[in-house]
């Protein structure tokens, strides 16, 4: 019994005065706790408790069941215990056959004995099997056995206590071990859908897929920088043992342009948080935005090739594309293509392939694009470059000298004289007159331009070179003039082209 | 014997929650999962989540998922079932009982009536 | 979630009786079985647990068998306190679910 200093409250005694007790089945139970301030009698084994208000314990008939540790207990809270065998031949173990262990951590396989005289008290697997070689174990006569650090790999094992009693095994009824996992990753979240796009009233469904090792993973759909609680519907399948997967599914039956936004799906264990987004846009109607990919105003030069090429984004999905030239429709030439095969992608390609274009094939080419909703449209303005042409060189009545000449961009005609037999025309002849004429063609078409000079100034033999140029190239024309006396001829005017 | 006693009789409106509770006497509460099981006038049970008081980290059935949140106190061996969102199908009576994680329930409460209605 | 079908739904019979009632999992689920027992405003009572397991307590007339999809709960000869209606449930995973039942009347 304990010992105390005179003064203070000391623990109650219990009689008869020693730690355990064994008795034989069907033998009486007498306990009696002293104490001035007694308060109660209290009787525990395997998680269940019973009181007991006298002071004397009596079981007349001791049963197996009544194995177990009997505590007094006074005013003061303190309290002295006695631990009471009952020797049950038939009945060596007390069980309760719930057997649970979470990963990493011991777990108690609750088969106390009735008789602590037994030898060789342990585990045992089921129908004979070993159990497994790193699984190890501490038994307790009085609590069960405590197996340590219990493993992922123990869960469902079939397991049994074990004494030898009079040289023969007995075997408890079966436990089976039900291992509750550690977490030691974050969930794996992910989302159906990364971004959608809605018109106005129509149903936003996203699905946010959490795995993990158990079904108590936490998860819900979060409207960022909102409180309000959103509605979800939840399937979930076990494919296996720790490997449990939930599909939660966000639903707006009607969406609203001011449910735009980004929703979170949302996962934490005891491990950690994980979480994955999706964006929402809706629109109150359909869009087609066009973006050109080169300059909407062409210069190409003649016989050369372009590509007239536009993005667009469309939604909902483009339905009629074409590409328009002088009032009519290209059937070929053209190809059209998404960006991406991303089922959420809205932009899209067009593009016109334009071969050895010529100076006539100038003008407006139009990418027209539609969808449910709307119309859209873009126009190229295509110049194309082409060399000076001289139309007509000419002396006229009034002994003017003219040149007329055609290309794109505008040509610059300049004049130079050539006295007597020298090639080179060097010395350059101011015009008289110069004029861009209105062409008959089309807006994008050459430009005319018409330059005089007076044939007057010229006093001797000699050739006249009116030269018409732009970016491209030039082109020449000549007057040749002789003079008989005081006369002056205009001998058969040539041309040079000069590329 | 271990025992589950549970709160008494809920009358609730439509979209309000109801807090059941379940207290363990005559035995501890920690080494045990509690499950709570409900069943609606004359229908089936129905498993609605499990909980270890040890640990408190709840599992759920998938109906109730979001709906449902199970809490223990430990120092009270009380656990405790909310349902939030309250419809009249779910009128019922709610039950605890002793187990619930890959086993079977070997000890129940008595049973607590819960009747939404407006 | 593993479907559980429990037949029949009811049956009538009559003291003394042998009566079986069967339950069909929608996947293997082993011997994780229990069956239950319930009477009107009482709450369920464990009849069998790990398909076959007689609960303490619980009166030998009462069996179960079966493994992986198909499981039996015989009474080997009806008393007057069986009538009531008996509930299969899995536990083979977390997720537990319950047959719906079968309402044994008398006769």
């Known amino acids: 019994q304990p010992s105390v200093s005179p003064g203070e409250p000391s623990p109650p005694s219990i009689h008869p005065g020693k730690s355990d007790l064994i008795v034989r089945v069907g033998d009486e139970i007498r306990l009696l706790c002293t104490d001035p301030g007694f308060v109660k009698w209290t009787f525990e084994i395997l998680d269940e408790t019973n009181e007991n208000k006298q002071n004397e314990w009596i079981t007349e008939k001791a049963e197996a069941t009544n194995t177990g540790k009997y505590t007094c207990t006074n005013k003061h809270g303190l309290s002295n215990s006695i631990y009471v065998f009952v020797r049950d031949p038939a009945k060596l173990f007390l069980v309760d056959r719930s057997l649970y262990g979470k990963e990493d951590n011991d777990t108690l396989v609750r088969c106390p004995l009735t008789d602590p005289e037994v030898t060789n008290y342990s585990l045992k697997g089921c129908q004979g099997k070993p159990l497994p070689k790193d699984l190890r174990f501490i038994p307790d006569p009085k609590a069960g056995i405590m197996i340590k650090s219990v493993k992922r790999a123990y869960h469902r094992l079939c397991l049994h206590c074990s004494v030898d009693q009079e040289g023969k095994s007995v075997l408890s009824e079966k436990f089976i071990l039900k291992v509750r996992p550690a977490f030691k990753a974050v969930p794996v979240v992910s989302v159906s859908k990364a971004s959608y796009l809605l018109r106005e009233g129509e149903e936003f469904t996203v699905t946010c897929t959490i795995k993990d090792v158990s079904s108590s993973v936490y998860s819900t759909w979060k409207r960022e920088n909102s409180q309000t609680k959103l509605q979800e519907k939840y399937n979930s399948w076990h494919h296996g043992d720790f490997n449990y997967e939930r599909q939660a599914t966000l639903t707006i039956s009607s969406a609203r342009v001011n449910d735009s936004g980004v929703f979170m799906c949302y996962a934490n264990n005891t491990f950690g948080s994980a979480n994955v987004t999706t964006t929402l846009e809706v629109v109150d109607k359909g869009f087609i935005n066009i973006f050109p990919m080169i300059n909407t105003t062409v210069f190409v030069n003649d016989g050369e090739n372009v590509d007239l090429i536009v993005e667009y984004e469309a939604f909902p999905k483009p339905e009629h594309q074409q590409w328009i030239y002088m009032n009519r429709t290209f059937t070929d030439k053209w190809e059209d293509y998404p960006k991406s095969e991303n089922e959420s992608n809205i932009r899209y390609v067009s593009e016109l392939h334009l071969t050895r274009l010529k100076g006539t094939e100038g003008g407006t080419y139009t990418f027209l694009v539609s969808n449910s909703d709307v119309n859209a449209a873009i126009a190229f303005n295509v110049y194309v470059n082409t060399k000076p042409e001289i139309l007509t060189y000419d002396r006229l009545v009034n002994g003017m000298l003219q040149c007329v000449a055609a290309g794109f961009p505008e040509p610059t005609i300049d004049w130079y004289f050539c006295p007597g037999t020298e090639q080179r025309c060097s010395a350059s002849v101011l015009p008289v007159d110069v004029q861009t004429l209105n062409s008959s063609g089309p807006p994008f078409g050459k430009l005319v331009v018409q330059s005089s000079i007076d044939s007057s100034a010229f006093k001797h033999n000699g050739t006249v070179e009116c030269k018409a140029y732009n970016d491209v190239g030039k082109t020449s024309a000549y007057f040749n003039f002789a003079f008989k006396g005081n006369n002056k001829e205009q001998i058969h005017p040539h041309t040079l082209f000069t590329p | 014997q271990v025992q589950l006693v549970q709160s008494g009789a809920e009358v609730k409106k439509p979209g309000s929650s109801v807090k059941v509770s379940c207290k363990a006497s005559?035995?501890?509460?920690?080494?045990?999962?509690i499950s709570w099981v409900r069943q609606a006038p004359g229908q089936g049970l129905e498993w609605m989540g499990v909980i270890f008081p040890a640990e408190g980290a709840p599992g759920y059935a998938q109906k109730f998922q979001g709906r449902v949140t199970i809490t223990a106190d430990e120092s009270t061996s009380t656990a405790y079932m909310e349902l939030s969102s309250l419809r009249s199908e779910d009128t019922a009576v709610y039950y605890c009982a002793r187990g619930g994680y890959i086993s079977d329930f070997d000890v129940w409460g008595q049973g607590t009536l819960v009747t939404v209605s407006s | 979630d593993i479907q559980m079908t429990q037949s029949p739904s009811s049956l009538s019979a009559s003291v003394g009786d042998r009566v079986t009632i069967t339950c069909r999992a929608s996947?293997?689920?082993?011997?994780?079985l229990a069956w239950y027992q319930q009477k009107p405003g009482k709450a369920p009572k464990l009849l069998i647990y790990d398909a076959s397991s007689l609960q303490s307590g619980v009166p030998s007339r009462f069996s179960g068998s079966g493994s992986g999809t198909d499981f039996t709960l015989t009474i080997s000869s009806l008393q007057p306190e069986d009538f009531a209606t008996y509930y299969c449930?899995?536990?083979?995973?977390?997720?537990?679910?319950f047959g719906q039942g079968t309402k044994v009347e008398i006769k």
């Open positions: 996947q293997s689920i082993s011997n994780y």
């Open positions: 449930q899995q536990y083979y995973y977390e997720s537990i679910t």
């Open positions: 005559g035995g501890t509460f920690s080494s045990y999962a």
